[in-house]
């Protein structure tokens, strides 16, 4: 709390300008009118105020707007945004994408801070859903943004927004998140032809069920091993050797290098050894010839 003192003669600020950097904290408090500051917030960004001086300016705005700043002020906060706490931001009502962009720009190049996370949360909740323009903006600033959302939050993403998603945006997504995103992607890209469809859907396949993988195996897609290794184990297990061979195409040779890792390891354990031998890769661990394979999941379904 800055002590209230009278403004020295001749120092009353008539505008927010560069001369204010030479004011002491108490002079800023006494000589800068809060309403003047609010209307000229855009100028603050061009002035090299110290953090202590920014604290005073923030304090003045807090006094002027105890219920939260109006968007006209928020949009021009610039690096004063870095002084805001999540509690401050929760009082805001940010509806303009331009305001969001302006504040994300201030934090650009840094990790997502609690302030930014709160800002995004307020913005998305205000909009009701994560529309394409918002998603475009957020993933441009934070490629990992999508994967920071819970499956519940992801369920509010409309399929049309999926077009904004780049492969790198999904790098840190876990299977539960991809389970939510995959059906949306499938819907979004449904009118594309085979090869184009595969290029777009590839990043989302960690959420694909067995039947979709079987369908893809009929389309000469030549899935790379990196994508195959990210598939759900439970979706890969029912695939036959022939289906996996078709799915991977020339990349099938890569299975040898991955035979000790999931899902390849678990898939090998489910295949007949003589079927695996047809690949000529020396994969070991399949079911020996003459053994009966009981599909317990089918047994349960029938009983």
């Amino acid at each position: 709390e800055v002590e209230k003192t009278a403004c020295p003669s001749g120092k009353k600020a008539r505008e927010i300008d560069e001369s204010l950097i030479f004011y002491k904290k108490w002079e800023l408090e006494a000589c800068v009118d809060a309403a003047l500051l609010a209307t000229q917030m855009d100028r603050v960004n061009a002035i090299p105020f110290t953090y202590e001086q920014l604290d005073v300016l923030k304090h003045k705005l807090d006094e002027l707007y105890p219920q939260g700043y109006p968007e006209s002020v928020i949009q021009h906060l610039g690096y004063l945004f870095l002084k805001m706490s999540p509690e401050d931001i929760r009082k805001w009502n940010v509806t303009s994408l331009e305001t969001l962009k302006a504040l994300l720009e201030v934090n650009k190049g840094h990790e997502m801070s609690p302030q930014v996370a709160t800002l995004i949360d307020r913005f998305v909740k205000g909009r009701g859903q994560l529309d394409k323009d918002t998603l475009d903006t957020l993933t441009a600033f934070y490629p990992g943004y999508l994967c920071s959302l819970s499956p519940e939050e992801l369920s509010s993403v409309p399929p049309s927004s999926i077009w904004a998603v780049r492969p790198q945006d999904l790098d840190t997504c876990d299977p539960r998140q991809l389970d939510v995103l995959y059906p949306k992607a499938r819907l979004a890209f449904q009118n594309m032809n085979g090869s184009e469809y595969f290029v777009k859907i590839q990043s989302f396949l960690g959420g694909a069920p067995t039947e979709d993988l079987k369908a893809l195996s009929q389309q000469n897609v030549s899935m790379d091993l990196a994508t195959f290794m990210k598939l759900r184990t439970d979706a890969v297990l029912p695939l036959t050797v022939a289906e996996v061979q078709k799915l991977l195409g020339p990349h099938v040779e890569g299975l040898k290098a991955e035979e000790r890792h999931r899902p390849v390891r678990d898939w090998i354990l489910r295949q007949r050894q003589d079927d695996l031998d047809t690949l000529g890769l020396g994969l070991q661990g399949g079911i020996p010839n003459g053994y009966l394979v009981l599909d317990l999941s089918m047994q349960e379904a029938l009983s």
Epitope: D17, G78, V106
Partner: nanobody, 114 residues
């Protein structure tokens, strides 16, 4: 990687002049350029500032003696220091705000002997 390179510091007699310069490279749209100084055992203080609009402002202690200017084409800011006094002895550091982000130079030593 933004770089600010200062030059022009040195040893000068009281009443003499020096011209400091600070060149910014790999930088975006510059909003303001300023000079700060820190004397031994004291806090860093602003000396002069020039904005993108060309308006300038000075600390009371240097008014009438120091002049700040900038060359936009070269992304360079200058500080012409005349009538130097021993109390102007300090490390002078340039500060630039570009695309709403602040950057500091390494500093250049100015020593004024009596």
């Amino acid at each position: 990687q933004v770089q600010l390179v200062e030059s022009g510091g040195g040893l000068v007699q009281a009443g003499g002049s020096l011209r400091l310069s600070c060149a910014a490279s790999a930088i975006g749209s510059i909003n303001s350029m300023s000079w700060y100084r820190q004397a031994p055992g004291k806090q860093r203080e602003p000396v002069a500032v020039i904005t993108d609009r060309g308006s300038t402002s000075y600390a009371d202690s240097v008014k009438g003696r120091f002049t700040i200017s900038r060359d936009n084409a070269k992304n360079t800011v200058y500080l012409q220091m005349n009538s130097l006094k021993p109390e102007d002895t300090a490390i002078y550091t340039c500060h630039v705000i570009a695309d709403w982000r602040g950057y500091w130079g390494q500093g250049t030593q100015v020593t004024v002997s009596s």
